[in-house]
């Protein structure tokens, strides 16, 4: 039987909720302009969908989406409408080596640009079991893609 790895279990207190806790603003070196942020978000919307399609071997079926999944956007007043990248980044960094896909590396680069916090980055470990690894990757990819897509609508 599979046992869920401890590090995965407490990893970051979950995908998206953590961002609000981790935000410690000490003033960014360069503050992105709203238009720049919007351009990155639009690009991420396209990339995340393509990355999910790649992972699912171009699956065209409608994926189940639960509207009460946590938002991937922060409500922070200093970064209105910005992606909660500090919460998402550790997960993408964890799954990226398994994806072996340039898109995931580029997504990480873009999320890094939106990461205005100097908060210490929590490490996220991939599950060791193959099935759990696949579930972990697909959960994150689908969540991120759906979250961005949902916002675009």
């Amino acid at each position: 039987m599979v046992s869920h790895i401890g590090s995965t279990r407490f990893a970051l207190f979950l995908l998206c909720c953590l961002g609000t806790l981790m935000f410690s603003h000490t003033g960014p070196i360069y503050q992105l302009q709203p238009k720049e942020i919007q351009a990155i978000i639009v690009e991420l919307q396209n990339l995340s969908k393509k990355l999910l399609d790649d992972y699912l071997n171009k699956e065209k079926g409608v994926q189940k989406f639960d509207s009460d999944l946590p938002s991937c956007f922060t409500s922070d007043s200093q970064a209105p409408g910005n992606i909660n990248s500090s919460a998402i980044l550790p997960y993408f960094k964890a799954i990226s080596p398994s994806l072996n896909n340039d898109k995931s590396l580029y997504i990480i680069e873009q999320l890094d640009k939106l990461n205005f916090q100097n908060a210490p980055e929590t490490e996220v470990s991939m599950p060791t079991d193959n099935f759990e690894r696949k579930r972990f990757i697909l959960t994150i990819l689908r969540w991120f893609s759906n979250c961005l897509e949902h916002r675009a609508q």
């Epitope: 039987m1 699912l56 079926g61 972990f136």
Partner: antibody, heavy 118, light 113 residues
Amino acid sequence: QVQLQQPGAELVRPGASVKLSCKASGYTFTSYWMNWAKQRPGQGLEWIGMIDPSDSEIHYNQVFKDKATLTVDKSSSTAYMQLSSLTSEDSAVYYCARQDIVTTVDYWGQGTTLTVSS
Amino acid sequence: DIVMSQSPSSLAVSVGEKVTMSCKSSQSLLYSINQKNHLAWFQQKPGQSPKLLIYWASTRESGVPARFTGSGSGTDFTLTISSVKTEDLAVYYCQQGYTYPFTFGSGTKLEIK
């Protein structure tokens, strides 16, 4: 629409083997795992195992480890379950079911009624 | 293996009545990554294959009537039918999809008076 087609019935002799099929259509076969379950007459459902068609990773319920062998043929989008050394205890309805690993089993085949009798 | 316990094993109700059935797991089914409980409810009508009603403990599958509601978290789950119809005559199974083997409950048989 998603469809999982299974033969209606199979009649086999005790001690023999049988290979049950499940032909998938209406979705990308390699994007979802395939589960198999057993249901004896008037009884509940028992999970046999699952296979990932993309790379043939398999997980069995230990109870069925020596009884069932799961395989797939990607070219025909068909999943198979071979049952060996059949006895009357193996007489049951066998279902294949599509597994979305993020959510759940979401589509079931109509089931194959296996009768083991001499 | 995770053990799934369902109760009652059967119940008989009149059309229009509210029905509640329980499913308990021997360990938590909460997946920490997305805070979803990997618990599904299936309906199996006589002579038919099972049909998905609820996944993630409380998310109704597309096309399933609103009278079916799933609730609960961790180890205790409930399926409620707000106003039973004659076509609801079936056996209802819960299944955990948290970790393999993906065990089923023994089922609750719903009969109509």
